[in-house]
Structures are given as structure tokens and as C-alpha cells.
């Protein structure tokens, strides 16, 4: 029988490359430390060395914040990186940072209570769906702060967290991995190609959800490069390195817990948390500032960059193994990500193949775990939540079809990310 | 999709041995999957084992186990088959395949012409 | 191991007829599921692959179809060159197990 090793990563500042990733060091208290370059090394070693800059040939070079290096003004990119005041813009009406508004049509299923409540946060909009109160008076006036309509005399409405509010971005606001819910039934209708397998995996532009569907679905944001250079996001006024997680403070909402953020790169992902429908014990507690109930007195067993209690659980969520196999010729790439289950004892194989940044194949099969076991080519390289696989399949059913009509370099890697379960910020779930 | 190049018909003694060779070209043999399998006339396939050829690695059904060796040439892109102890119940055709780009699932896409192998005193 | 009870046996079609071979797996094998032709005296060759994917360079008017433990491959339109012996196999589980075959002759 085949040992799956795990593959050889780096570990620096809890957090995981692979072999070959290069990145800046984020250093307190400077932030990001351009002059210097990071090199996972093959045996697991990071490798850190100043950048050495060239010398410029003109009389004034200018220093720019993302580069190390000065240069010469006729070398520097387009105007339009320069960083310009965090204002939002939506429906052709520019917002200010902090400043609230009401957006008409975002949700389908909007109920007649409920109204579009949208925020600009750092050159992001954040919009969600608001339950307004019954109101007992003839004529009720609108007021600044809300998209509810309030008696006079009212005071400002909190927002009401209800299970099916969802955080989303406009439809109208590029976002390159905005991964939507693809409605795939189980039985698939496995066509040539494969991609038939998802026939609701719906076009960025108005795929809209109402509150039932809300599920699974990754509310990419992007922060707008004019806005913030470097690998670093920016929200509500704090500033996070790649990799680092919190939960988003928006001003109209408060810290919302059941949605967590992620920075990649420069772009926040955020995603709403689902809670397990079972624990690992008898009497989950509620415990204020965390959005699923816990178990009381569960130590987690920290493994690196992930946490795990001794029965494979994540956040009270069972965990299973995750494989991967890359394979090159002849300038394709083949890569395959496989989730190995208990019941049944099977593994889900995904099939990616990628000539010059086009798909040129992509198909899901399940394999017997007995077969799998004598693949030898496969690697252990995490373990995932059922929710997190989830999110893993409804975004590979959007980028199986935007990739297979134009170029995708770091799609499938992005998404494959959302895998790896990051160790729990604070205890944070 | 490649070709496969099986040797020539065996006649072989109860008892004795039987090396099969199968010459691969048109894929790249050291990420291959080569399967063996048996056919007696007029009857279904049967699948023996198979072989990583990246690795050397071999899995066999439990039926053959003991039975069949397989082992690689990655120079000459050759995949072999012994057969050992055999009797007459040993006598088929013996095909080599190799599975479908792509997948894991073992689907026989390219196959030899096959080796016909006769146990007979 | 899995097994695959093949039906028909044999059958004999008029060209242009419409053949349907069905078979049945005993436990689910998840679209895991291969058709293979085999002319006399000739290697098998992939038909149908992941129960319904066509392999490269076969007619179209070969289709395959099924779920769980129940799977059927459909001829439309019989030609002469189709007279062979068709084996159904699956691929979910070691060992891959084949059905016993149906021989396919015209009539």
C-alpha cells in the first residue's frame, strides 16, 4: 500500500508556502517590508535576503510605496495607481467612506419588510438585507442611517442578524473570484468535457441569491489597487497581511460574527460562517462575540496552521483528508484535488487540465477508498470542513466555465485555498 | 493516445514460467498506469494488475496474487508480465492496456493486440 | 469483489434498429462504468466511458446512460460494422470487474 507523505511546506509567522512561493515578510510595526524577498525552500526552510537595488541613472528618482527600489520618473507605472481618497462607487453615484445608502433590485427575494442596506467601508461596498419593524403610524419618514422607514420620534434601528441576512457585493462591482452558488444536483449529467455537470452555475452579472440559498456563497471584495498598494487589505481602517482572518466591523452592523474575512493577496474574501448541525457533545454553548455554539471545556489540538480537536473536528465541524496530484507534459497541467470520505468510503476526485491558461478539461469521478489507497501519486496536503468542500465545488462550477473561454493563471490555485482551514483567530470560529 | 506492442504467442510446459512484454510509445511511459488483463475464449476479461511505471509500484487482484510479477523498463518504455507455475487453466490471451488520460477510474483506452498463451504438455 | 450482471446474452438486430444492452452492478459504483466493443480476433476497444462520456473517434449514435447500480449503453440506428461482443466493466473498485457480455449480430 501506497504512504502518502504530506508535502513540504514552510511555516513563517503561522502561516503556510509552499515550495518555490516567494513573498515580502510583514514585519511589525513597518507593515509590509518590500526590500526584502522570502523564499520557501525546498526543504522547508524560509530564505530571506535584502533586495539590492540597481543604481538610477537621473537626477530625482522617485520612491514609490509597493517597490523597494527608487526609479526614474519615466519608468514608473500608470498614473492611475496613484492612491486616491477610499470613496465607493456604485450605479455611477460615488460614495463616501463611512457614508450609507439603499440600493433597489440587488436581491430577488427581497421580502416586503426587508430593505437594501448597503455601506461604503474603504472602497468597498457592503450591502445586506435589513428586517425593518412593523410600524404603528400612518406616515413614517426616512432617516439618514437606515434604509427602514421609522416612526418620528423612533431611534435608530439596529440591524436585525437573522440567519438569512447575507453580506454581498453589488453586482456591478468586478470581483475576478467571486465564486456564486451553482444549484448542481448530486446525479450528474456527465456530458464530454464535464462541465455540463453544473448547468446553474450562474454569470457574475446579476447572480443574485435570496436569503434561503445563502449557504456556501463567497462574498469576494475587491480592494481597488488605485486605493491600497501592496500585499495588504485594508478594513475599516485596519490593515491585514495575506493569510490573516477577522471578522468584518461594518458601521451600520456592528462586528458581524457569523462572517469571516480573509485577506488574500489584496483582496478580502468573506464568507459567511455555517454553523454544524451536530457537535461532538451533548450541550453546545453560546458564547457572546463567537457565531456557532461551542463545546465547553474542548481544547484544540493545534497542528500548523490549522486546529483540530482529537476526533478530526474544526470548530466543531468533522474534517476529512485532502489530496493533491500535479502533473505537467508537454506544457498541460493536470492538476487533481481529491476528498476522501468515511460514509461511503469513497473519494471524490477533481480533474483539472490547463493548456496555456485555458481549461481544456475538467471533470469530477468518485473512486472506491480502497482504489484510491493504491494511487501513488497523490499527496496529503490538508484537511477540510463539508462546508468548506462545499464552497470548494460551487466555486470550481463558475471557473470551470469562465476558464475554459479565457486565460486563468491563478484561479484554481486561489480557490483551492479555501481548503485549508486557518487556525481560529482568538478562538474565533 | 499512444501504442502498445505485445510479444509474440507463447506455448509453455505445465509448471513452467512466462515472461510478456508490452513496448509502449506515444505517452510518457513514467506516468502510465499499465493493467494486464486475461481473456479466455469465447468468455469476459479479467483484470490481473497493475503497474505504475513511475514508481514500480504494482497492485494485483488478490486472484493473481502470487501468480503474476509485473516489473518496468523505463529506458525502453516496457512494461513485463511473469506468469509462474502455470497450468492449463492459465491458457487465454493476456492484453496489456493502458487507462485513460485524465482519469483515475481504470478506463482501458489504449490495449495491445494481446499475447496468446498455451499450457500444454 | 463488484459484479456485473450483463443482459442480454446475445441478440440479433436489422440495421437501423435501435439496440439497448442494460447492466447491472451489485452494489453503487457512482457512474464509475465503461462499455467496451470487441470485434473476433481483435482487442477491446473503449466505447463509453464515466457511464455516458463518449470516447474520442466513436460514433455518435452510441450513448450511454444510468445511476447507482443500473446502467444501459443504446445503439441507434444498428450498422453492419456494429456486430461485435460488448462487455460493460466498472472502475469504482479494485478489482474493475466486467460484465459476462452480450453478442451482437445483424440479422
Known amino acids: 500500500e501506497q504512504v502518502k507523505h504530506s508535502e513540504t511546506y514552510c511555516m513563517f509567522q503561522d502561516k503556510k508556502y509552499r515550495v518555490g512561493e516567494r513573498w515580502h515578510p510583514y514585519l511589525e510595526p513597518y507593515g509590509l517590508v518590500y526590500c526584502v524577498n522570502c523564499i520557501c525552500s525546498e526543504n522547508g526552510n524560509v530564505l530571506c535576503s535584502r533586495v539590492r537595488c540597481p543604481n538610477v541613472h537621473c537626477l530625482s528618482p522617485v520612491h514609490i510605496p509597493h517597490l523597494c527600489c527608487p526609479r526614474c520618473p519615466d519608468s514608473l507605472p500608470p498614473v492611475n495607481n496613484k492612491v486616491t481618497s477610499k470613496s465607493c462607487e456604485y450605479n455611477g453615484t460615488t460614495y463616501q467612506h463611512g457614508e450609507l445608502f439603499v440600493a433597489e433590485g440587488l436581491f430577488q427575494n427581497r421580502q416586503p419588510n426587508q430593505c437594501t442596506q448597503c455601506s461604503c467601508s474603504e472602497g468597498n461596498v457592503y450591502c445586506g438585507l435589513k428586517t425593518c419593524p412593523k410600524l404603528t403610524c400612518a406616515f413614517p419618514v426616512s432617516v439618514p442611517d437606515s434604509c427602514c422607514r421609522v416612526c418620528r420620534g423612533d431611534g435608530e434601528l439596529s440591524w436585525e442578524h437573522s440567519d438569512g441576512d447575507i453580506f454581498r457585493q453589488p453586482a456591478n462591482r468586478e470581483a475576478r473570484h467571486s465564486y456564486h452558488r451553482s444549484h448542481y444536483d448530486p446525479p450528474p449529467s456527465r456530458q464530454a468535457g464535464g462541465l455540463s455537470r453544473f448547468p446553474g452555475a450562474r454569470s457574475h452579472r446579476g447572480a443574485l441569491m435570496d436569503s434561503q440559498q445563502a449557504s456556501g456563497t463567497i462574498v469576494q471584495i475587491v480592494i481597488n489597487n488605485k486605493h491600497k498598494h501592496g500585499q495588504v487589505c485594508v478594513s475599516n481602517g485596519k490593515t491585514y497581511s495575506h493569510g490573516e482572518s477577522w471578522h468584518p466591523n461594518l458601521r451600520a452592523f456592528g462586528i458581524v460574527e457569523c462572517v469571516l474575512c480573509t485577506c488574500n493577496v489584496t483582496k478580502q474574501e468573506c464568507k459567511k460562517i455555517h454553523c454544524p448541525n451536530r457537535y461532538p457533545c451533548k450541550y453546545p454553548q453560546k458564547i457572546d462575540g463567537k457565531c456557532c455554539k461551542v463545546c465547553p471545556g474542548k481544547k484544540a489540538k493545534e497542528l500548523p496552521g490549522q486546529s483540530f480537536d482529537n476526533k478530526g473536528y474544526f470548530c466543531g465541524e468533522e474534517t476529512m483528508p485532502v489530496y493533491e496530484s500535479v502533473f505537467m507534459e508537454d506544457g498541460e497541467t493536470t492538476r487533481k484535488i481529491a476528498l476522501e470520505t468515511e460514509r461511503p468510503p469513497q473519494v471524490e476526485v477533481h480533474v483539472w487540465t490547463i493548456r496555456k491558461g485555458i481549461l481544456q478539461h475538467f471533470h469530477i469521478e468518485k473512486i472506491s477508498k480502497r482504489m484510491f489507497e493504491e494511487l501513488p501519486h497523490f499527496k496529503l496536503v490538508t484537511r477540510t470542513t463539508l462546508s468548506q468542500w462545499k464552497i470548494f465545488t460551487e466555486g470550481e462550477a463558475q471557473i470551470s466555465q469562465m476558464c475554459s473561454s479565457r486565460v486563468c493563471r491563478t484561479e484554481l490555485e486561489d480557490l483551492v485555498k479555501v481548503l485549508y482551514l486557518e487556525r481560529s483567530e482568538k478562538g474565533h470560529c | 493516445q499512444g501504442q502498445m506492442q505485445q510479444s509474440g504467442p507463447e506455448l509453455v510446459k505445465p509448471g513452467a514460467s512466462v515472461k510478456l512484454s508490452c513496448k509502449t510509445s506515444g505517452f510518457t511511459f513514467s506516468s502510465s498506469y499499465i493493467s494486464w488483463l486475461k481473456q479466455k475464449p469465447g468468455q469476459s476479461l479479467e483484470w490481473i494488475a497493475w503497474i505504475y511505471a513511475g514508481t514500480g509500484a504494482s497492485t494485483f487482484n488478490q486472484k493473481f496474487t502470487g501468480k503474476a510479477q509485473l516489473t518496468v523498463d523505463t529506458t525502453s518504455s516496457t512494461a513485463y508480465m511473469q506468469f509462474s507455475s502455470l497450468t492449463t487453466e492459465d491458457s487465454a490471451i493476456y492484453y496489456c492496456?493502458?487507462?485513460?488520460?485524465?482519469?483515475?477510474?481504470?478506463?482501458?483506452?489504449?490495449w495491445g493486440a494481446g499475447t496468446t498463451v498455451t499450457v500444454s504438455s | 469483489d463488484i459484479q456485473m450482471t450483463q443482459s442480454p446474452a446475445s441478440l440479433a438486430a436489422s440495421v437501423g434498429e435501435t439496440v439497448t444492452i442494460t447492466c447491472r452492478a451489485s452494489e453503487n459504483i457512482y457512474y464509475s462504468l465503461a462499455w467496451y466493443q470487441q470485434k473476433q480476433g481483435k482487442s477491446p476497444q473503449l466505447l463509453i466511458y464515466n457511464a455516458n462520456s463518449l470516447e474520442d473517434g466513436v460514433p455518435s449514435r452510441f450513448s450511454g446512460s444510468g445511476s447507482g447500480t443500473q446502467y444501459s449503453m443504446k445503439i441507434n440506428s444498428m450498422q453492419p460494422e456494429d456486430s461485435a461482443t460488448y462487455f460493460c466493466k466498472q472502475a469504482y473498485d479494485l478489482p474493475p470487474t466486467f460484465g459476462s457480455g452480450t453478442k451482437l449480430e445483424i440479422k
Open positions: 492496456a493502458r487507462k485513460r488520460a485524465y482519469y483515475e477510474g481504470l478506463y482501458f483506452a489504449v
